[in-house]
């Protein structure tokens, strides 16, 4: 077990009758009290506030209001704390708290409590929605929590409204009891304002209680006026009208995506949209509501507009041989024609779709370059450029050679590569390597993917040297012995230490 109490959160009794508050409690088994005591407090759980003592098992001392009117029906040893209050009067209405006293430090005022309501009229329950033409159930309910006095129910002014059905004594969710009598009938507009009564009497007593309720027959709204679907060009003016019939007049609400745009208690409501934008495209709902029901209708607004500037997603850098996938997307109404160009050549196109996927299998250096994605509908055209960079190992082009002129030799090493390679000239017969960093002898210039490195040799020598050009990037290296063109005289310059 654990500390806990169970009692109805609220309980009712007719003035002058009695009330039994069902109660049970629990505590940890290991506490093993020799004897269990208990106290019922009125209106406050804090002993420091000196609340009136309703009942105390250790002594007979109780507050004067409860003298001779309180008795414990439960057996505390069996963890039953049921309390009986007799001859209840209005001042006994309030909160009732139970405190378990197990000796030692184990005294626990349970936070669970019962609120006692002293009543003097039966409760006639008319459904919140009494709608003309729909069968309704009206009930008369009275508390039946006094074991000594049981109420009897009868209807007043129910002629022409059907025969009552007595349900008898019913147990409520929290263990309290009620006597219930039911009336079933179909209300008409004419029944509006009809006064219906219920009487509770207690046999062998003079106690008698009456209650009345006026019938209020209503009907829910019906939307009777509404635009059909609307098409509008971006920037134009749109008016949406909603009208409803109901009693009482409804609250009319124009909504979109759960957001209230305009509302008023009225029979019709106009929603004006100035200079509509694509953001206002969608379904608009008119909700008509009163206390007895609701109706709703929707209207679609379609805002037509030119495509937005396309966005391009995908791999913009690829290695030769890889497959490249590029997605071009936009938004427009209606959906556009999407096209991807490279150098005025159409690579892919799609009609009335907002996305276009371009797949380039096994890209080559020729695929490197600028591409355009163009979106177009009857309201306009937008384009976005993007660059695809294809990376590959160096390729030494055939125009690479050496040529002699008077006292110099010039060697051209022409390399196509991405990314840019490093270039070195090797003179094996001299055991010398000249890197492009040695600006005195090597001049390099790049045009697109082609790098031209020029080695200039000055001086005098008997025979032209062998020159090997090596180009290298992260994808590999290529070497080529440069062929000589023209005369074989050579001036030689000493390079290095």
């Amino acid at each position: 077990g654990h500390w806990g109490a169970w009692m109805p959160s609220s309980i009712s009794a007719f003035e002058g009758t009695c009330v039994s508050i069902p109660c049970r409690f629990d505590f940890p088994d290991e506490l093993r009290p020799a004897v269990v005591h208990g106290v019922w407090y009125f209106n406050s759980p804090y002993p420091k506030n000196y609340p009136p003592v309703v009942f105390k098992s250790r002594t007979q001392v109780v507050h004067e209001s409860f003298q001779g009117r309180s008795r414990l029906l439960g057996d505390l040893g069996l963890r039953n704390c049921t309390l009986l209050l007799s001859n209840v009067s209005p001042e006994l209405g309030g909160k009732y708290y139970f405190r378990g006293d197990l000796g030692g430090y184990n005294q626990y005022t349970f936070s669970e409590h019962s609120v006692l309501d002293i009543v003097n009229t039966p409760n006639i329950v008319v459904p919140p929605e009494v709608v003309a033409g729909t069968e309704v159930e009206v009930s008369c309910m009275v508390p039946d929590n006094c074991p000594e006095l049981r109420p009897e129910l009868s209807w007043l002014g129910h002629e022409g409204l059907g025969e009552p059905a007595v349900l008898g004594r019913l147990r409520e969710d929290e263990g309290t009891w009620v006597q219930v009598s039911l009336l079933h009938f179909v209300p008409t507009r004419e029944a509006n304002g009809h006064r219906l009564g219920c009487q509770a009497s207690f046999p062998n007593t003079t106690l008698q209680f009456e209650g009345y309720a006026s019938m209020d027959v209503k009907y829910p709204p019906v939307i009777v006026e509404m635009n059909s679907s609307v098409e509008a060009i971006e920037g134009s003016h749109v008016s949406l009208l909603c009208g409803a019939d109901s009693n009482p007049p409804p609250l009319l609400t124009w909504m979109r995506d759960g957001t209230v745009l305009r509302e008023a208690v009225a029979e019709s409501l106009l929603l004006e949209l100035e200079e509509v934008t694509p953001a206002e495209d969608g379904v608009y709902a008119c909700l008509a509501e009163n206390a007895y029901g609701q109706d709703n209708r929707t209207v679609g607004l379609s805002v037509m507009y030119a495509p937005w500037k396309p966005t391009v997603n995908g791999t913009m850098v690829a290695v030769e041989g890889e497959t490249v996938s590029i997605l071009c997307s936009t938004q427009s109404n209606p959906d556009p024609i999407l096209t991807i160009f490279k150098e005025k050549q159409i690579l892919s196109t799609v009609i009335y779709e907002s996305e276009l996927q371009l797949e380039l299998p096994a890209v080559s250096p020729e695929d490197d370059g600028e591409y355009w994605c163009v979106a177009e509908n009857q309201y306009g055209q937008r384009a976005t450029a993007f660059n695809l960079s294809v990376e590959f190992a160096p390729v030494l082009l055939l125009e690479s050679h050496c040529a002699a002129a008077r006292d110099t030799v010039q060697c051209l090493c022409v390399v196509k590569s991405n990314p840019e390679p490093s270039v070195a000239f090797e003179l094996p017969s001299r055991n010398v390597t000249v890197n492009e960093s040695e600006r005195e002898f090597v001049y390099s210039e790049r045009s697109g993917l082609v790098l031209t490195s020029i080695l200039t040799l000055r001086g005098q020598a008997q025979a032209p040297p062998r020159v090997i050009c090596t180009a290298r990037n992260l994808y590999g290296a290529k070497s080529l012995e440069l062929p000589f063109q023209g005369a074989h005289r050579l001036m030689w310059a000493k390079i290095g230490p």
């Epitope: 500390w3 940890p28 290991e30 506490l31 002993p47 420091k48 005294q107």
Partner: antibody, heavy 126, light 112 residues
């Protein structure tokens, strides 16, 4: 520092009454309960009960109902034990001891008596 | 009520030696809601009030030397003094504070 100072020794005749005081200092008086423990000469410890200093509600052990009354004067942070109709077997040292409490429900996080008064010897003899 | 029984009633131990006092409760003092044992150990010297040594069966009160330790759960508990000092001569009480509070009869510890 926490201190519980008890009143001095008492010599009483059978049938008389005695009131032992326990003055607390060094802590918030109403945040701790006050227990009373009896120790007869050469004997062990007997718990008599406690008083909730926040609510003023006393609780007595089964053997200490009737002639024993716990009370408080929170304005001077003092707890009292009154014994009426004294008997020879009431001769003992009476200790006060504090323990943490919870003023509303129950708080099982420390009901151990951590600080004790020095004790008051009550001798009942004709 | 829960009855607490200590053993032995008296105990003589040499200085520096280990002293062990046992306490048995007639019912478990382990509280199911928080899995704590509601058991304390007190030391009482002649003419003085009891002094709290251990609570929750094994938690040492601040200022208590670490040669004092408590163990056990449910119904069987032990107070151990790992190395007896002269100032440890006293009567030791176990105490349950789960239900209506009770003490053991006490164990008198002396130097051999």
């Amino acid at each position: 520092q926490v201190q519980l100072v008890q009143s001095g020794s008492e010599l009483k005749k059978p049938g008389a009454s005695v009131k032992v005081s326990c003055k607390a200092s060094g802590y918030t008086f109403t945040n701790y309960g006050m227990n009373w423990v009896r120790q007869a000469p050469g004997q062990g410890l007997e718990w008599m009960g406690w008083i909730n200093t926040y609510t003023g509600e006393p609780t007595y052990a089964d053997d200490f109902t009737g002639r024993f009354v716990f009370s408080l004067d929170t304005s001077v942070s003092t707890a009292y034990l009154q014994i009426s109709s004294l008997k020879a077997e009431d001769t003992a040292t009476y200790f006060c001891a504090r323990n943490p409490i919870n003023y509303y429900g129950i708080n099982y996080e420390g009901y151990v008596m951590d600080y004790w008064g020095q004790g008051t010897l009550v001798t009942v003899s004709s | 009520d829960i009855v607490m029984t200590q053993s032995p009633d008296s105990l003589a131990v040499s200085l520096g030696e280990r002293a062990t006092i046992n306490c048995k409760s007639s019912h478990s003092v382990l509280y199911s809601s928080n899995q704590k044992n509601y058991l304390a150990w007190y030391q009482q010297k002649p003419g003085q009030p009891p002094k709290l040594l251990i609570y929750w069966a094994s938690t040492r009160e601040s200022g208590v030397p670490d040669r004092f330790s408590g163990s056990g759960s449910g119904t069987d508990f032990t107070l151990t003094i790992s190395s007896l000092h002269t100032e440890d001569v006293a009567v030791y009480y176990c105490h349950q504070y789960l239900s209506s509070l009770t003490f053991g009869q006490g164990t008198k510890l002396e130097i051999k």
